[in-house]
């Protein structure tokens, strides 16, 4: 399963139509198409990875398929519109200041994505305020070729941002992952996603997300009460997406933060987080970028246990093996690392309660003059059962007032000749990221020690 | 608690360098921050010169064109601010400040602890 | 380099009572706006950050608004503490620019 190869499309798929949703028009589907394009899914799910360079495994180290690679096939699928939600945009050197040659995939990338625009293929960009990326010039440019771009006012709405980053292509593939619109995240950073081909059913679903965004980018728009009738989900954990991919029995649904962005029928970002770790019976592995049981980003800082508590509850009451890969950068908080320690400390083996934390620490090497880079981004979680691959990382804010989304898969092993589930290929995904030397535990780690490779 | 402190000569005489020191305790320099350069000038203006950054890097006022430099020592955790060829009109209180925090997907910068100044006189 | 003006420079109010304080930007700064208070011994400190956060420890009485050029600091029950000069400060962009100062008194 390393590297695949999406489809090959037989079928000229039917344009996109403009539809009302309640705020102006929206690059939306009509229902009737909508079922048509269904009756046609043959669903494929890809997972995707960036390993920055320089950033060698061991040899004979499985991996996903280059997030590059991926992304530039879907924009080659694309024949009618591209959507892409994503917290900032930065796909050239000069938008953050460097001059250096693995800003070039980014640059690339963005000159597809004109291209795109010149065949007449629509894009359509939500994007956050507060943005990261403030001086980057991608967004005038391509909305200068006529991409339409609405800046949602995260910061005035919810008082936090638009976090999440995905894709819907045709209204039939997916992208979603850690990975922004970022030059650096194909080259300098860490990344985890998946794609989905052909899944109109799950495409249709995200793009719902897509559309609170849309609506809310609008001048003055306020958060509605009750979301429209059209906004609602009928997939979800209760109601999962049931169907073969690739000839392989799955379930999959796609949540979203914060609540108030989802509408009827949506499960919210970490009720699904936490229905995955509560249906954990054998073991809980999880990659992220921060975890902190607080609040993050507002004051005063408030305790939130909430995920904490769970990891705790399954090591502790079911003997769940808790697994926890926590990233460590230049930029990382080293206020994590108490309730990290808090954490592991939970760990008894004599009494079946197995808690281990690592952080995995990329190597800046010559990579000094790229900003914010050489971190180990991913969002996800896997346990026997289910894959969790998000947008968010774990602390409250990412779930009380930032926009995420979580895809949750699971799929019936045995039932294929070849080929792992994507539970298993998640799993092992993490097992070669925490069993490689990049994975330090924190005893290695002394207390204030800046998150410097030490070879 | 992150305490900052200037100090330096508070008399310079024109066309020499102004030569200042801020002293940083309870915070490394090389970690999470922007540390800054802050000038108010009589009748309270207040000019942005310039930062260090954590990993050594630079950005300077535009204004001050190539009259500023801002180094570092981070084994005695200060920064420096040099400012070349003073006349009279950079007369002021010279502030140095911390921004950030610069964590990773952090929007919202904000100069949170400042030093309380010292002032420079430029007069022959 | 984007301009911040604070148009009145002085203003005072009563003790208990509510003030405005206005700060305007040469161009829209989508709430990438601080304000400071700097007390008469020269002491300067953050007051609000990206136009309405209140930081850690700063009395709720203090509180701001504002959207695309147009923002304001209102300081709601002013104490005797109060008196103070008030900065904006954006930072949508470098340089980092301030505002001329407001300053507060007590009749």
């Known amino acids: 399963w390393q590297v695949r190869r999406p489809p090959t499309w037989g079928q000229v798929q039917p344009k996109d139509v403009p539809r009302s949703w309640g705020h102006g028009s929206s690059p939306a589907l009509e229902p009737l198409e909508a079922e048509v394009r269904k009756q046609r899914d043959s669903c494929q799910l890809v997972l995707v990875e960036s390993i920055p360079q320089d950033l060698p495994f061991a040899a004979g180290s499985l991996s996903a398929q280059p997030l590059g690679q991926a992304w530039l096939q879907l924009l080659d699928t694309a024949q009618e519109s591209v959507h892409v939600a994503s917290y900032y945009w930065s796909l050239t050197g000069p938008d953050i200041g460097v001059n250096d040659s693995s800003s070039q995939l980014g640059e690339a990338l963005l000159q597809k994505l004109q291209q795109l625009l010149g065949r007449n293929i629509s894009l359509a960009v939500a994007t956050s305020s507060p943005t990261l990326a403030r001086k980057s010039t991608d967004l005038q440019v391509l909305a200068a070729r006529g991409a339409q771009v609405r800046r949602v006012p995260m910061g005035r709405l919810t008082r936090g941002v638009l976090h999440s980053k995905f894709w819907v292509v045709d209204g039939r593939h997916i992208y979603m992952g850690s990975a922004n619109m970022d030059w650096r995240s194909l080259t300098q950073v860490k990344e985890l996603g998946a794609v989905i081909y052909n899944c109109s059913h799950l495409a249709q679903d995200l793009e719902k997300t897509f559309q609170t965004y849309w609506v809310l980018g609008v001048p003055k728009a306020v958060l509605p009460k009750t979301w429209p009738q059209n906004f609602s989900s009928h997939i979800n954990r209760f109601q999962p997406f049931q169907g073969l991919f690739d000839g392989v029995p799955t379930t999959a649904y796609f949540s979203a933060s914060p609540p108030a962005l989802c509408p009827q029928g949506r499960t919210p970002d970490l009720e699904a987080l936490l229905a995955v770790m509560g249906s954990a019976q054998e073991f809980i592995y999880a990659s992220v970028m921060e975890y902190f049981p607080t609040t993050r980003f507002s004051h005063p800082r408030r305790y939130w246990p909430v995920l904490d508590n769970a990891l705790r509850a399954a090591a502790f009451s079911k003997g769940v093996r808790v697994r926890l890969l926590v990233s460590c950068g230049l930029n990382t908080d080293p206020t994590m690392f108490p309730y990290l320690r808090s954490l592991q400390a939970l760990s008894n083996p004599a009494a079946n309660v197995s808690v281990d934390v690592k952080v995995f620490i990329v190597p800046v090497g010559n990579h000094s003059n790229i900003p914010f880079s050489r971190v180990n981004h991913s969002k996800f979680m896997v346990t026997e059962k289910a894959a969790y691959i998000g947008t968010s990382n774990w602390s409250e804010d990412y779930f009380s007032s930032t926009t995420g989304v979580g895809l949750v898969v699971t799929q019936s092993p045995g039932a294929q000749p070849a080929g792992a589930t994507v539970q298993e290929q998640l799993r092992q995904l993490f097992e070669r990221d925490w069993s490689s030397r990049y994975a330090v535990g924190l005893d290695g780690q002394a207390p204030g020690q800046d998150c410097v490779w030490q070879g | 608690d992150v305490q900052l402190q200037e100090s330096g000569p508070g008399l310079v005489k024109p066309s020499q360098s102004l030569s200042l020191t801020c002293s940083v305790t309870g915070y490394s320099i090389s970690s999470h921050y922007y540390w800054s350069w802050i000038r108010q000038f009589p009748g309270n203006r207040l000019e942005w010169m310039?930062?260090?950054?954590?990993?050594?890097?630079?950005n300077y006022n535009p204004s001050l064109k190539n009259r500023i430099s801002i180094t570092r020592d981070t084994s005695k955790n200060q920064f420096f601010l040099k400012l070349n060829s003073v006349t009279t009109e950079d007369t002021a209180t010279y502030n140095c400040?911390?921004?950030?925090?610069?964590?990773?997907?952090?929007?919202?910068?904000?100069?949170?602890?400042w030093g309380a100044g010292t002032t420079v006189t430029v007069s022959s | 380099d984007i301009q911040m003006t604070q148009t009145t420079s002085s203003l005072s109010a009563s003790l208990g009572g509510s003030v405005t304080i206005s700060c305007r930007a040469s161009?829209?700064?989508?709430?990438?706006l601080n304000w400071y208070q700097q007390k008469p011994d020269g002491t300067v400190k953050l007051l609000i950050y990206y136009t309405s956060r209140l930081h850690s420890g700063v009395p709720s009485r203090f509180s701001g608004s504002g959207s695309g050029t147009d923002y304001s600091l209102t300081i709601s029950n002013l104490e005797q503490e109060d008196i103070a000069t008030y900065f904006c400060?954006?930072?949508?962009?470098?340089?980092?620019?301030f505002g001329g100062g407001t300053k507060l008194e007590i009749k």
């Open positions: 400040a911390r921004e950030g925090p610069l964590y990773y997907g952090n929007p919202y910068w904000y100069f949170d602890v």
């Open positions: 310039g930062y260090i950054s954590y990993d050594g890097s630079n």
């Open positions: 400060q954006q930072f949508n962009t470098l340089p980092r620019t």
């Open positions: 161009q829209d700064i989508d709430n990438y």
